[in-house]
Structures are given as structure tokens and as C-alpha cells.
């Protein structure tokens, strides 16, 4: 289709070479059509399209993206050539960060309903660069954290670096749904719910004396629980002593439960204690059983391939440890009698 | 018993201003709350003014044609107040003040039966 | 802001019959809304909050549904005491649980 009547919107995407993040594109389509298929009120009240309006239907369900090519070829879809972008609805998620992500990427409705919707269709240049050394170091992660049920805030990463009072005007989204609202480079969060997690997409205009372009950043936001107090606990074992039987082939499980750490390094190991002498056993990688908001569950086995004599006179002993403090159950293995 | 009791209505002129006291009883303020001014003009519908927010950012929240002529503040853990300046006849309402918040905005609901303030000459 | 637009603005039903009152959001408030009764020199009364959760003491005749942009109250089995000024308000305000914009109103008229 001809892509001359879209209209065109240009974004740049600085990413740090330290960091994951991902970025998006949203097919900013005029109104009204969009809201048919995508999220309502993705354009701001000031954003007023210059096209003719879309005489879409309402069994629109999706749009369709393509990247054109630099050397003039063809359009190509975008799901069939390019493993590390995904579209979620009316959104482009780009999982990896690149220069090679470089380029014009063009939406439009799946379904053409009318003679006005073939030039229903937005051409969006993507211009992608690495941050420079030059740029603000104490920039605000693509990654940030929200303490439930306390205060927090939601950064710009690449307005960080500037004070409020500096600081252009910011067009922030929540999930892809536009937070009409906020309009700084920061986002006040007066009381943390699980509402908060999400994705935020956070844009402002750059303008030089030729064209003006819209910076845009990704931020992936978790609510969390305050980092725990306690040192880890050992479910299982529970008794200091397994009744077992000689030859036979035994697994010795270790379950423990560590409270939430932002910082999380969690430690379990078998270790074999034999009179004087103690050393750690090479077992299975631990695995986790069970993870909630507040807390994980963390398995790690001993495997014998048969139970010895020699096994009897040895204290087999799952050693936890935290950033808080460790602890230890010891197992002494007695043979079964009868 | 949870209360809140509006203070400071009165007849005022045009042009002059006026601080409305919000006096919680049974409670004071704290985290999860917003304490909101709301207006109702004689016969009309509700009209959102402010709120505040009674937790550490102490962020305010207004209605776009409030900004810069009504300004609510918290005095202490048991007092909100609503200063108005530049007054017209237009501001004649009853005004209420009503706690909310908690996630989905009203799960503390709470109203006080309202001032009345009269702007004439 | 958020305008909120509330129809009808008047709405007239015998006893024991039903009344719908809609609500529309300028924009997506998900399911942050809340429903109140107004009773002449009386301040409002909570009745309905997250678009369909009952406040307490609230008998469940009253019924709220809806998200994003539009929301209904819907009042079954009307008694005489129902007659009262209903407003939505809108109780997000970018990320936060702010109650703010109301709708217009609705006068129900018991008959």
C-alpha cells in the first residue's frame, strides 16, 4: 500500500549499554478509530490529528506493523521477520536494545473498511543510540522499585538528570493508557498497591532548528515488600534423625523459606560432617518451589546412591544463609530396624 | 465516632477572601487518606475542589479552575483548611469537606454536613 | 481533568420499579468510580466505590457495573426513601486513588 498519506511521527531511543530495557512504538493512529481496537486516549487533547478521520468499524481488532526497509525493498512484516520484536495489540515491544533497531516501522488497521482508511496508517522513524559518556551517570534505572504501602516515585531515565523546574513537559503512559495528568519527569506515588506494577512509557519533545523528535523512554516498575528482617527458616528437614535402610538408594530434601531482598543471594548447601572433618557436597542446583510477594521457598536435595554403614556415623547437615544471618539442621541417619 | 466538622462560612465580599476549617474528630489524619474539599452551589451539583493527601508526599490535587485562587493546606493531624481569595458571586455554595482514599479512592468515606458561604455585597 | 457526564439528568419510576443512571468518563478511569446519594441539606452518601462494590450498611437493590469509560447505577425494587440527587465520581487521578470530578447528578422521582 502507498505510505505517502500516513502521517509521520519521529522518536529516538537512547539505551544504556549497562542495562537492559526494552522499548515501544504505539500506533498512534487519528482518532477516532483508535479506540475501536486499541487502548482509549492515547493522544493527549493537544495532539489533534491533521488527517481525514478513519471511518473504521467497531469490529476492528487489530493493527498490522511493518518495518520499511532502507534500500527501498518492499514492506515486511514485522511478526514474521523480526524474533526480538513482539506486538501486544496496538503495541510494538522491542525486547533487546540495538542500533539495528533503527528505522521506520508503519502501522495501519488490519481491516480497510472504506476509501479514507488506506490512508489510515502512521510511519513512525525510530532513530536508536547508545547513551553516550557524556550523558547524566546517575540516571534513573529501566528497572525501579515501588515499597508497598509507602510513598515512592516513578523517574524519567532520561530526564533524571534534570530538575523539576527544568524539565520539558512529559507525556507519561501506564500499560500503554495514557496518565493525562502527569506532566513532570516524575511520577508521585503517594501510597504503593500492586496497582502501580507495570510497564511506564515516559516522552518528551526534543526540537533543533530543522525537526523536532519525541525521547522516549521504557520503565518496568515492581511493587515489593520491604527487604525482610529475619535470616532464612528450614522447613525440611524437620527431625534431627531419618530412619533409613542400608543399600538402598536415598534423597534427603532441603526446603527453606527466605523473606523478600531487593538484593536477593540466597545460599543452601549439603555438607557432610564426619568426627573432625566437614565438607560440602556437590548436589543438584537448588530449585524454587514456591515464590510470593513476601517470600521464596527454595529446594535443594542430597542424592545417596545407597545408603552405607559409614553413612550412619555421619551428620549430614542443610546449611541457609541470607544477607541477614544463616542456619543450620543437621541429619543423622539411623538404620531401620525390622 | 469518626467526625468531620467544616468551619469559617459567613457572607464575604466580592473580591475578598476567606480560610474554611475541616476539624476531624475520632480519627486523625494519616496514610491511605485524602481530605478533599467539595462545593455544591444553591439547587446545583457537587463540584470537586482539592484534596490533599495526609501521608508523607503531602501531595495536593486540584480541580483545573481552583489552581492558583483556592489552596488547601494541612494544619495538623486533625485539621485541613481551604484558603480562597479573589471571591465572586459565584462561589456562593455550601462547602464540604470529606475524607477518601484507599485503593480505589473512597474505601474511607467520610463527609461533614458542610458551611455555607455567601458571596454578596 | 476528567469530565465526567452523567445521564439522565432526571429520572421518574413507581415503587418497586427500576431506574438506570449512566455515567461516562472523558477518558479510561478503569474501575475507579464511585456512586453517592444526596438527600436535600444532607452531604452525600456513599453507596457504591471501584464501580460495583458495596459500601457498608448499602442494600445490594443498588447495583453498580462498568469500567473504562462508562458506568451504570442501576436501583431495583425503588422504595420511597430512594428518592434523592445520585452522582458518580471519578476516584483515580493519574496513578493515584484521588477522589475527584463528579457527574452532573440525577434526580430519581419515586412515584
Known amino acids: 500500500f502507498n505510505i505517502s498519506g500516513c502521517s509521520t511521527k519521529k522518536l529516538l531511543w537512547t539505551y544504556s549499554t549497562r542495562s537492559e530495557e526494552e522499548f515501544v512504538l504505539f500506533c498512534d493512529l487519528p482518532e477516532p478509530q483508535k479506540s475501536h481496537f486499541c487502548h482509549r486516549n492515547r493522544l493527549s487533547p493537544k495532539q489533534v490529528p491533521e488527517h481525514l478521520p478513519f471511518m473504521g468499524s467497531n469490529d476492528l481488532s487489530d493493527v498490522q506493523w511493518y518495518q520499511q526497509p532502507s534500500n527501498g525493498d518492499p514492506l515486511e512484516d514485522i511478526r514474521k521477520s523480526y524474533p526480538h520484536i513482539i506486538q501486544d495489540k496496538c503495541t510494538l515491544h522491542f525486547l533487546t536494545p540495538g542500533v539495528n533497531n533503527s528505522g521506520s516501522y508503519i502501522c495501519r488497521p488490519k481491516m480497510i473498511k472504506s476509501p479514507y482508511d488506506v490512508a489510515c496508517c502512521v510511519k513512525m522513524i525510530l532513530e536508536v543510540k547508545p547513551q553516550t559518556n557524556a550523558s547524566c551517570e546517575y540516571s534513573a534505572s529501566h528497572k525501579q522499585d515501588l515499597l508497598l504501602g509507602s510513598t515512592g516515585s516513578i523517574s524519567c531515565p532520561s530526564l533524571s538528570c534534570q530538575s523539576d523546574a527544568q524539565s520539558p513537559a512529559v507525556t507519561w503512559y501506564k500499560n500503554g493508557k495514557l496518565l493525562s495528568v502527569e506532566r513532570s519527569n516524575r511520577i508521585v506515588v503517594d501510597e504503593v498497591y500492586d496497582y502501580h506494577q507495570g510497564t511506564y512509557v515516559c516522552d518528551y519533545t526534543q526540537s533543533d532548528t530543522v525537526s523536532s523528535w519525541t525521547v522516549r523512554a521504557v520503565v518496568q516498575v515492581r511493587t515489593i515488600v520491604g527487604d525482610t528482617k529475619l535470616k532464612p527458616d528450614i522447613l525440611d528437614p524437620v527431625e534431627d534423625t531419618l530412619e533409613v535402610e542400608l543399600g538402598k538408594p536415598l534423597t534427603i530434601s532441603c526446603k527453606a523459606r527466605f523473606g523478600f531482598e531487593r538484593v536477593f543471594n540466597p545460599v543452601i548447601k549439603w555438607y557432610i560432617k564426619d568426627s573432625d572433618l566437614e565438607w560440602e557436597v556437590s548436589v543438584p542446583e537448588a530449585k524454587s518451589i514456591k515464590s510470593t510477594l513476601k517470600d521464596e521457598i527454595i529446594e535443594r536435595n542430597i542424592i545417596l546412591e545407597k545408603v552405607t554403614q559409614r553413612d550412619l556415623r555421619r551428620k549430614f547437615v542443610c546449611f541457609v544463609q541470607n544477607s541477614i544471618g544463616n542456619t543450620t539442621q543437621s541429619v543423622q541417619l539411623k538404620e531401620k530396624r525390622g | 465516632q469518626e467526625q468531620l466538622v467544616e468551619s469559617g462560612g459567613g457572607l464575604v465580599q466580592p473580591e475578598g477572601s476567606l480560610t474554611l476549617t475541616c476539624t476531624a474528630s475520632?480519627?486523625?489524619?494519616?496514610?491511605?487518606?485524602?481530605m478533599c474539599w467539595v462545593r455544591q452551589a444553591p439547587g446545583k451539583g457537587l463540584e470537586w475542589i482539592a484534596c490533599?493527601?495526609?501521608?508523607?508526599?503531602?501531595?495536593t490535587y486540584y480541580a483545573s479552575w481552583a489552581k492558583g485562587r483556592l489552596t488547601i493546606s494541612k494544619i495538623s493531624s486533625t485539621t485541613v483548611t481551604l484558603q480562597m481569595t479573589s471571591l465572586t458571586a459565584a462561589d456562593t455554595a455550601t462547602y464540604f469537606c470529606?475524607?477518601?482514599?484507599?485503593?480505589?479512592?473512597?474505601?474511607?468515606?467520610?463527609w461533614g454536613p458542610g458551611t455555607l458561604v455567601t458571596v454578596s455585597s | 481533568d476528567v469530565v465526567m457526564t452523567q445521564t439522565p439528568s432526571s429520572v421518574s419510576a413507581a415503587v418497586g420499579g427500576t431506574v438506570t443512571i449512566n455515567c461516562r468518563a472523558s477518558?479510561?478511569?478503569?474501575?475507579?468510580l464511585a456512586w453517592y446519594q444526596q438527600k436535600p441539606g444532607q452531604p452525600p452518601k456513599l453507596l457504591i466505590y471501584?464501580?460495583?462494590t458495596l459500601a457498608s450498611g448499602v442494600p445490594s437493590r443498588f447495583k453498580g457495573s462498568g469500567s473504562g469509560t462508562d458506568f451504570t447505577l442501576t436501583i431495583s425494587d425503588l422504595e420511597c426513601a430512594d428518592a434523592a440527587t445520585y452522582y458518580c465520581?471519578?476516584?483515580?487521578?493519574?496513578?493515584?486513588?484521588?477522589?475527584?470530578?463528579f457527574g452532573g447528578g440525577t434526580e430519581v422521582v419515586v412515584k
Open positions: 490533599i493527601y495526609a501521608g508523607s508526599s503531602g501531595s
Open positions: 475520632g480519627f486523625s489524619f494519616s496514610s491511605s487518606y485524602y
Open positions: 470529606a475524607r477518601g482514599g484507599g485503593s480505589g479512592g473512597v474505601d474511607n468515606n467520610l
Open positions: 471501584k464501580a460495583s
Open positions: 465520581q471519578c476516584t483515580l487521578y493519574g496513578v493515584n486513588f484521588v477522589p475527584n470530578a
Open positions: 477518558e479510561d478511569i478503569e474501575r475507579f
